[in-house]
C-alpha cells in the first residue's frame, strides 16, 4: 500500500479495507483481521460483528463490509439487525414464559412467531361466518344474513371485463 | 417457564478451586450459550467468558484466561464454571446468563468468598 | 475490546421525573446494546435489546434509542419500583462487556 501523498487530508486516500496507519506515518495499512472499513479514508478498521450461539453466519465479515447474522433452524429474529432470536412456534400456538401454547378458543395464530390474534367478527361489518376459524386460520366472512335470507338473489352480477395484460389485484 | 437454577454459596481458601454449577430447566439447553458474569460487593458487572453446550466450545475473557474453565453435563442441563487460584479479589457473586443476543434469563447467583 | 461508559454514575429523582442514562461505546456497535435493571440482592433483569426494542412484560413507561456508539435509556415517568442501578451492555463481539452502571436513588 502506497503512502498517500494529498496535499489535503493525507488518509484520504486510503481506500475501504484499509485504515490510516498513523503509527506507521499515516501509511494506509489493510485492516487486521476480524475487522473491516466499509468506507475510504479512515483512521481505524471496526471489528466485525460475531454470530455465535443462536445465531448463525448469513454472511462471512470481509476487509470492506462487516458480518451478518440470522438464527439458526428453529429460531426468528426479532429488533433491528437481528439483535435477538426467539424461538418458534407451530401454527396454531404462541411463545409464553411457559415455552409454546396453543391458542385460546377465539384466536389464531397463522405464522411460527407473533401472539394468537382474535378470530375477526364477521357481524361487525354485518356480515356472517361462512367458514369456521380454527386456531391456526381466521374465520372467513361471507354474505351478510340478510343477503342470504328466502327470495334473495344468489347470484352475483357478473365481474367487469379487464383490459389485456392486467392481473387481478 | 425458563430457570436457571445455581448452587449454593461457597467459602474458599486463597489458592484453592470453586466450582459454580448452574441447572437450566424449561428451555432446550442446548439452543442457547450460557455466560458467566461475576459482580463483587458494591461493584458493577464483569463478564468473564462463555460456554456453548451444544458443541462444548468456550470464549474467555483474557483477565480470567488460563483460570476459568467452563463445562457442561447436557445430560443433566446443566453448566459449570470453574475457577482456580482463587484469590481474595475474586470474593463476588458469581451469575450463569443465558444467550438469545442480550442475556434475558439469569441464574439467582452464587457468593464465593475468598477467605484465610 | 469495546469499552463501555455510562453517565451520570448516579442521579437522584423524584416519582414522576423523567430520566436519562446514557451509554457510549468505544467503537461503533450498530444496535447492539442492551439495557438491565438490578436491585439490591437481586440478579440483573433485561429491560431493552438492540437498542430500542423493549423485553417482553417490560413497562412501556422504559424505552432505548441510539445507534453507533451513543445510546440512552429514558424511563418516561419514574415510579417507585424503578429506583434501582441501570447498566448498558453491548452484545456486538466478545468479550461482552457492561457500562459502570448508573445508580437512580429517591431525592
Known amino acids: 500500500f502506497e503512502r498517500t501523498r494529498s496535499l489535503q487530508d493525507p488518509c484520504s486516500n486510503c481506500p475501504a479495507g484499509t485504515f490510516c496507519d498513523n503509527n506507521r506515518n499515516q501509511i494506509c495499512s489493510p485492516c487486521p483481521p476480524n475487522s473491516f472499513s466499509s468506507a475510504g479514508g479512515q483512521r481505524t478498521c471496526d471489528i466485525c460483528r460475531q454470530c455465535k450461539g443462536v445465531f448463525r453466519t448469513r454472511k462471512e465479515c470481509s476487509s470492506t463490509s462487516n458480518a451478518e447474522c440470522d438464527c439458526t433452524p428453529g429460531f426468528h429474529c426479532l429488533g433491528a439487525g437481528c439483535s435477538m432470536c426467539e424461538q418458534d412456534c407451530k401454527q396454531g400456538q404462541e411463545l409464553t414464559k411457559k415455552g409454546c401454547k396453543d391458542c385460546c378458543f377465539g384466536t389464531f395464530n397463522d405464522q411460527k412467531r407473533g401472539i394468537c390474534r382474535p378470530w375477526t367478527n364477521c357481524s361487525l361489518d354485518g356480515k356472517s361466518v361462512l367458514v369456521n376459524g380454527t386456531k391456526e386460520r381466521d374465520v372467513v366472512c361471507g354474505p351478510s344474513p340478510a343477503d342470504l335470507s328466502p327470495g334473495a338473489s344468489s347470484v352475483t352480477p357478473p365481474a367487469p371485463a379487464r383490459e389485456p395484460g392486467h392481473s387481478p389485484q | 417457564q425458563v430457570q436457571l437454577v445455581q448452587s449454593g454459596a461457597e467459602v474458599k481458601k486463597p489458592g484453592a478451586s470453586v466450582k459454580v454449577s448452574c441447572k437450566a430447566s424449561?428451555?432446550?439447553?442446548?439452543?442457547?450459550?450460557i455466560n458467566w458474569v461475576r459482580q463483587a460487593t458494591g461493584q458493577g458487572l464483569e463478564w468473564m467468558g462463555w460456554?456453548?453446550?451444544?458443541?462444548?466450545?468456550?470464549g474467555y475473557a483474557q483477565k480470567f484466561q488460563g483460570r476459568v474453565t467452563m463445562t457442561r453435563n447436557t445430560s443433566i442441563s446443566t453448566a459449570y464454571m470453574e475457577l482456580s487460584s482463587l484469590r481474595s479479589e475474586d470474593t463476588a457473586v458469581y451469575y450463569c446468563?443465558?444467550?438469545?443476543?442480550?442475556?434475558?434469563?439469569w441464574g439467582q447467583g452464587t457468593l464465593v468468598t475468598v477467605s484465610s | 475490546d469495546i469499552q463501555m461508559t455510562q453517565s451520570p454514575s448516579s442521579l437522584s429523582a423524584s416519582v414522576g421525573d423523567r430520566v436519562t442514562i446514557t451509554c457510549r461505546a468505544s467503537?461503533?456497535?450498530?444496535?447492539?446494546l442492551n439495557w438491565y435493571q438490578q436491585k439490591p440482592g437481586k440478579a440483573p433483569k433485561l429491560l431493552i435489546y438492540?437498542?430500542?426494542s423493549l423485553q417482553s412484560g417490560v413497562p412501556s413507561r422504559f424505552s432505548g434509542s441510539g445507534s453507533g456508539t451513543d445510546f440512552t435509556l429514558t424511563i418516561s415517568s419514574l415510579q417507585p419500583e424503578d429506583f434501582a442501578t441501570y447498566y448498558c451492555?453491548?452484545?456486538?463481539?466478545?468479550?461482552?462487556?457492561f457500562g459502570p452502571g448508573t445508580k437512580v436513588d429517591i431525592k
Open positions: 438492540g437498542a430500542s
Open positions: 467503537q461503533r456497535i450498530n444496535n447492539y
Open positions: 424449561g428451555y432446550t439447553f442446548t439452543s442457547y450459550d
Open positions: 446468563a443465558r444467550e438469545t443476543g442480550p442475556f434475558d434469563y
Open positions: 451492555q453491548q452484545s456486538y463481539s466478545t468479550p461482552f462487556t
Open positions: 460456554m456453548n453446550p451444544n458443541s462444548g466450545n468456550t
